[in-house]
Interface confidence: medium
């Protein structure tokens, strides 16, 4: 697994414990909370970082409508149980044997239960929509600059083929960033936009999971765009299942 | 590569405590759990606990709790088990083993040798 | 807790053999089974984990399947460094819990 040779840390993931471990005295690192071992030339799974993140000690408008099956992620924080590839199990339980099914970011897609509850596969999550609002500036930013600066930060920072990136919307404060990847689309290496979108989200929160890389530094024709929100939906390939007490 | 080496043969006798020790080599101490499993002569394999290495908190089996302790040195890569109270169904061979932090890396891919634990008067 | 029981306790094989060793919880685990090789003398090896991941260096003969609570171990063609005892073993929920171990024997 790649790392940086030189200190022997993790660039895309400062939540491992790196050693020259591997075949030849190579740097090798591993996630916090899992021991597992990871790949430092691409982003970690999320399930990792949470998994990590539960470990460390505590401290009718062109914007685009989500529809009645997005799921928004409110339950916060969970120490998840991940496959040996590192992603979400489709079934997660607690301590005090309450399980529930997620999706492939790892998002409750189902009410509670108990033990006998079956998850029967892990639902792709395929499309993603971030919800930004930015500080107030001395005028809007020009849509095609905000586009494109976006789009390169998604490919340079955490290594997304463009293809996935299918929209910027700008109606200011408002910024909507719609990731789209199906099951068959996304190819062998390719970064999850799962994986991305987690990252970007932490990013924005000041909480960069990059290895000593400066916080996120987002300018659009050298204005600072600085986010003070930041909401998440996602989208599943089969619709989730609530009853309709949750719903109401 | 990767090694777990434990402390040698004891003879007890019941009523004293026994502790084991388990040097890791070859990994990170801190990137993995430690646990600890016994094996009476002609048994199978019973869990005792393990110990979260990067937090240092352990866990124990019901059925140990109260006369088990799971410890660890980082400085020196070194995890513990010590058993007081000891009795003749005690004796066993006590094994160290890697494993990961969470329920899906409780597999145990590195083994130590083994320590045999005769408890007798 | 939960109780893993494996099926046969022990076993009469020949080399060139496919065998298969079965292994049944008593509540769901997921896919959080281990499969272990014992010889006589010597600490237990891992060979499957998660029910059906390969650990590295096992040969492929070995094979894992099963999810909830019914797990298999199969080797597709017994080689004479096989035969030995093997353990099951769920890590799914603390306490962790073996099987009582399948003994397999040169016929």
């Known amino acids: 697994h790649t790392a940086a040779q030189d200190n022997c840390t993790c660039p895309t993931n400062k939540m491992t414990v790196c050693s020259p471990d591997g075949p030849g005295g190579r740097c090798q690192c591993r996630a916090l909370g899992s021991g597992v071992a990871v790949d430092c030339s691409t982003l970690t799974s999320k399930c990792l970082l949470l998994k990590a993140r539960m470990s460390a000690p505590k401290n009718a408008r062109t914007l685009v409508r989500p529809n009645e099956h997005a799921l928004v992620d409110n339950d916060g924080l969970y120490d998840p149980d991940c496959d040996p590839e590192g992603r979400f199990k489709a079934r997660q339980c607690n301590q005090t044997s309450v399980c529930w099914c997620v999706n492939s970011v790892g998002v409750r897609r189902t009410d509670k239960g108990d033990l006998s509850l079956r998850c029967d596969e892990l639902v792709r999550t395929h499309h993603i929509l971030i919800d930004l609002r930015h500080r107030p500036t001395a005028g809007a930013f020009n849509h095609s600059d905000l586009d494109a600066e976006l789009r390169r930060l998604f490919r340079e920072r955490y290594r997304l083929h463009p293809k996935f990136v299918a929209a910027v919307h700008y109606e200011q404060p408002t910024i909507q960033i719609e990731l789209r990847q199906n099951t068959s689309q996304k190819a062998a290496g390719d970064v999850d936009i799962g994986d991305a979108a987690y990252y970007f989200e932490r990013d924005v929160k000041g909480e960069s999971l990059f290895q000593g890389r400066g916080g996120l530094d987002l300018r659009v024709r050298g204005e600072p765009l600085q986010v003070e929100r930041t909401l998440i939906y996602y989208l599943d390939e089969i619709p989730p299942k609530f009853s309709m007490k949750r719903l109401t | 590569q990767v090694q777990l080496v434990q402390s040698g043969a004891e003879v007890k006798k019941p009523g004293a405590s026994v502790k084991v020790s388990c040097k890791a080599s070859?990994?990170?101490?801190?990137?993995?759990?430690m646990q600890w499993v016994r094996q009476a002569p002609g048994q199978g394999l019973e869990w005792m606990g393990w110990i979260n290495t990067h937090s240092g908190v352990p866990k124990y089996a019901e059925d140990f709790k109260g006369r088990v302790t799971i410890s660890a040195d980082t400085s020196t890569s070194t995890a513990y088990l010590q058993l007081s109270s000891l009795k003749s169904e005690d004796t066993a061979v006590y094994y160290c083993a890697r494993s990961g932090f969470g329920s899906s890396y409780w597999y145990f891919d590195v083994w130590g040798q083994g320590t045999l634990v005769t408890v007798s008067s | 807790d939960i109780q893993m029981t494996q099926s046969p306790s022990s076993l009469s094989a020949s080399v060139g053999d496919r065998v298969t060793i079965t292994c049944k919880a008593s509540?769901?685990?997921?896919?959080?089974v281990a499969w272990y090789q014992q010889k006589p003398g010597k600490a237990p090896k891992l060979l499957i984990y998660?029910?059906?991941y390969r650990y590295t260096g096992v040969p492929s003969r070995f094979s894992g399947s099963g999810s909830g609570t019914d797990f298999t171990l199969t080797i597709s063609s017994l080689q004479p460094e096989d035969f030995a005892v093997y353990y099951c073993q769920q890590h799914y929920i603390t306490p962790l819990t073996f099987g009582q171990g399948t003994k397999l024997e040169i016929k």
């Open positions: 998660s029910a059906s």
């Open positions: 070859g990994y990170t101490f801190t990137t993995a759990g």
């Open positions: 509540q769901d685990v997921s896919t959080a």
